[in-house]
Each structure stands twice: as structure tokens, then as C-alpha cells.
């Protein structure tokens, strides 16, 4: 038994960290391998972490952190029984990867303004909180060229855009996700999207 | 009521051996790392050695490598401290201490929060 | 090994007055935000030492709020805002990011 492909790995900056690698063969990965990791600091003690199957020869193991803070770095062992298949480190803030923002919502009553806001996926006291920035996907379902990406690269969870700028009388789709330059984060998974009608008073035009 | 209660200290010549205990009691005792500190006559504090929870992660003040161990056993609630090869210079009150929450991935840390009530080590021929 | 640097090493104080201790660090005890790994221990007359003040700022269970602990990186500080009799005896800070754990040389407080 063999790792054809390391083990990578991105944190969520708040309690879990992913790790997903490749074996060389069809692994039953959480009977047969065992993912040890451990932080370096002083009196720490190493921690299980049972992987899941992710495709034939394909692992993943998700492993539960207190938090994270820039200093942390933790050593990883990857066990088959007693065989060392695999030794490497990971620090966290290095390889972040945020949580997805919730509760898209669509609010389509402020006169011909489409308000659409949405929850930071972090708690205040966590420091992503304030380091967010935002891409809003936008798109027709009835229309495939018809998408646009928003950026918000201010702090706050919503984007304001007038409903004229969109097709009136068809429906749209719009999902979120989020970043953080400070890490130099990748972008989390897009969020669930949210469906709505889009109509507005066409204004009268005057010849 | 947490408590930590040492044992076993003595009057022993240089070059034996003396194995000190420290019972403990009141908290959840395999969860938290421990520590041994030692105060010659007279002097202040010196650390002397540490021991995760699990028995896993051991450290040594340097004046005492090679010739003392720190062990524990969780089943009993006890720590103890395997002191051979002594020498005058070990003559001290030793005292076992609560140290971090060590289960936890990162060891959780509220200070050395109780201590016993020290065991009298003499090294003299 | 991280030396802790104490002052004074003798403290004379009238009760009802402020006292103010200092500690210095070799190197940096900050692991990460609001985790200086430095505790205060007050050790009294034929007595085990007891924990007063943890991780720099944070005042351990049972400890009196007229001490109180503060600084980062390399330099604390323990004060008693009004000294009383019972405060005294030997004041000891301790490293605890790394071992060996070290400790100051001790500040003896007493009362004038």
C-alpha cells in the first residue's frame, strides 16, 4: 500500500481543517488508514483522524481544531496499521480556505433595487470576520450567456444593483462566496443559490 | 476539592535512588499535563520536568537528564518522579503541580493552578 | 533557555500603598494574540507557591482583584493596587511557552 498522491490541505481559519490525498490502488480508507496529527507546541498530544473514501483510491479526512492563529503548525502521520505510509507538516493560516457565506436572500421590494444580503460564515470574535470580501454570481436560467459576477470588496454582507440592469419578466439564480486577501485565501465554495422573478416598471420613453 | 498530595521524600547519599509520588484528586487527572518544581534551601523556584496527560510528551530541565524520570499512572491518579544518581545539589523541596489541559488539540493554559504541599529531599552522606 | 529578569528583588510597602513589579523576558513569550505565556506566583512563609496571575493579564480563581497582571512580548508587570498584610512574601514570575520553564529570581515584598 502506497500514497500515489500527498496529502494536501486547507483550513476553515475556525475549527476544521481538510485533508484529501490518493492511494495507489481502491482503499476501504477508514478501516485501513488512520490520519495522526498533532500541534507543535508544548504538551500537545496527538489526535486521530478517521478518513472517508473520496473515490475509488481517494481519501479525506476532516480534522477538528480548537482555532487556528497564524502561529499554529501542526506534524501529520499517515498510518496503514503499523506502517508509516506518509510523514508532513501543515500550517493552517498558510492554506486557508473559508467557509461558504448562508442565507442568501433576495429582496426584491425596495423600489426597482435588488437588494441581495447574505451572513458572514464567521463568528465576530474570529478574524476572518472583518477580512471578507465577497464575488456575487448572477445568472438566467433561461439565458446561459446571461451571467455576471459582482465583486464587494467592502466589509459588508450585501450587494444593492437596480433591477433594470437585469431582464425583466424571467427568473434568476444568484450564489455568493467569499475571500480573504490577508491570507491570500482561495475562494470558498459558492453558497446555495437562491432563486427569484425579476420585474420592474419599464420607464416610458419619451420620443 | 482539588488536591495534589506528595510522597517519598527522605534523606538518601549521593549516588541513590528515591521515587517521589504525587496523588491527585478532584479533577479529571489523565486530562491535564503535570509538572515537577524544586526549591533548594534558601533559593527560588526551578522547574525540573513536565508530562502530558496522556504520558506521550516528556520534558527535562537539563540538570536532571538522564538521571530522573517522570512517569505517571492515570489509573491510580498518580505522578511520579524516578530520581537516580543524586547528588547534593538536588536537595530541595520538590512539588508537583497542575499544569495545562493537554487533551485538547491545543493544550489549554490556566497556569500552574494548584500545587501540593512539597516533599523534603536531602542528598548527604 | 529563556531567562525572566525580575525588580526589584526587595519591596517595601506601606499597607494601603501600590506595589509594582517587573519581569523581563530573554525573548518573546507571545504565542498569539492574548496568549503571553507568563504566569505570577506568590509564594508565602513556609508555604507551596499559589498561582495569582496566567497567560500575562488573566487573574486565577479565588485571587483578590487588587493584583492584576499586564504586558506583552518581553515585559509584565504584576501590581497590587492596595497592599495588605497578608500579600506578603516572595513574588515569582514563570515562562511558560517553552521548556525549560524559567522563573524570575523572586521579588521579597514587605510591609514597612
Known amino acids: 500500500m502506497k500514497v500515489l498522491q500527498e496529502p494536501t490541505c486547507v483550513s476553515d481559519y475556525m475549527s476544521i481543517s481538510t485533508c484529501e490525498w490518493k492511494m495507489n490502488g481502491p482503499t476501504n480508507c477508514s478501516t485501513e488508514l488512520r490520519l495522526l496529527y498533532q500541534l507543535v507546541f508544548l504538551l500537545s498530544e496527538a489526535h486521530t483522524c478517521i478518513p472517508e473514501n473520496n473515490g475509488g483510491a481517494g481519501c479525506v479526512c476532516h480534522l477538528l481544531m480548537d482555532d487556528v492563529v497564524s502561529a499554529d503548525n501542526y506534524t501529520l502521520d499517515l498510518w496503514a496499521g503499523q506502517q508509516l505510509l506518509w510523514k508532513g507538516s501543515f500550517k493552517p493560516s498558510e492554506h486557508v480556505k473559508p467557509r461558504a457565506p448562508g442565507n442568501l436572500t433576495v429582496h426584491t421590494n425596495v423600489s426597482d433595487t435588488l437588494l441581495l444580503t447574505w451572513s458572514n460564515p464567521y463568528p465576530p470574535d474570529n478574524y476572518l470576520y472583518n477580512h471578507l470580501t465577497y464575488a456575487v454570481n448572477i445568472w438566467s436560467e433561461n439565458d446561459p450567456a446571461d451571467f455576471r459576477i459582482y465583486n464587494v470588496t467592502y466589509l459588508e454582507p450585501s450587494l444593492r444593483i437596480a433591477a433594470s440592469t437585469l431582464k425583466s419578466g424571467i427568473s434568476y439564480r444568484a450564489r455568493v462566496r467569499a475571500w480573504a486577501q490577508c491570507y491570500n485565501t482561495t475562494w470558498s465554495e459558492w453558497s446555495p443559490s437562491t432563486k427569484w422573478h425579476n420585474s420592474y416598471r419599464e420607464p416610458f420613453e419619451q420620443h | 476539592e482539588v488536591q495534589l498530595v506528595e510522597s517519598g521524600g527522605g534523606l538518601e547519599q549521593p549516588g541513590g535512588s528515591l521515587r517521589l509520588s504525587c496523588a491527585g484528586s478532584?479533577?479529571?487527572?489523565?486530562?491535564?499535563?503535570m509538572t515537577w518544581v524544586r526549591q533548594a534551601p534558601g533559593k527560588g523556584l526551578e522547574w525540573v520536568s513536565s508530562?502530558?496527560?496522556?504520558?506521550?510528551?516528556?520534558y527535562y530541565a537539563d540538570s536532571v537528564k538522564g538521571r530522573f524520570t517522570i512517569s505517571r499512572d492515570n489509573s491510580k491518579n498518580t505522578l511520579y518522579l524516578q530520581m537516580n544518581s543524586l547528588r547534593a545539589e538536588d536537595t530541595a523541596v520538590y512539588y508537583c503541580?497542575?499544569?495545562?489541559?493537554?487533551?485538547?488539540?491545543?493544550?489549554?493554559?490556566?497556569?500552574?493552578?494548584?500545587w501540593g504541599q512539597g516533599t523534603t529531599v536531602t542528598v548527604s552522606s | 533557555d529563556i531567562v525572566m529578569t525580575q525588580s526589584p528583588l526587595s519591596l517595601p510597602v506601606t499597607p494601603g500603598e501600590p506595589a509594582s513589579i517587573s519581569c523581563r523576558s530573554s525573548?518573546?513569550?507571545?504565542?498569539?494574540?492574548?496568549?503571553?505565556?507568563v504566569d505570577w506566583y506568590l509564594q508565602k512563609s513556609g508555604q507551596s507557591p499559589q498561582l495569582l496571575i496566567y497567560?500575562?493579564?488573566k487573574r486565577a480563581s479565588g485571587v483578590p482583584d487588587r493584583f492584576s497582571g499586564s504586558g506583552s512580548g518581553t515585559d509584565f508587570t504584576l501590581k497590587i493596587s492596595r497592599v495588605e498584610a497578608e500579600d506578603v512574601g516572595f513574588y515569582y514570575c514563570?515562562?511558560?511557552?517553552?521548556?525549560?520553564?524559567?522563573f524570575g529570581q523572586g521579588t521579597k515584598l514587605e510591609i514597612k
Open positions: 503541580a497542575k499544569d495545562r489541559l493537554s487533551k485538547t488539540i491545543r493544550p489549554r493554559y490556566y497556569g500552574l493552578d494548584v
Open positions: 478532584g479533577f479529571t487527572f489523565r486530562d491535564f499535563a
Open positions: 508530562i502530558s496527560g496522556s504520558g506521550d510528551n516528556i
Open positions: 525573548q518573546g513569550l507571545l504565542y498569539s494574540i492574548g496568549y503571553n505565556y
Open positions: 497567560l500575562g493579564n
Open positions: 514563570m515562562q511558560a511557552l517553552d521548556t525549560p520553564y524559567t
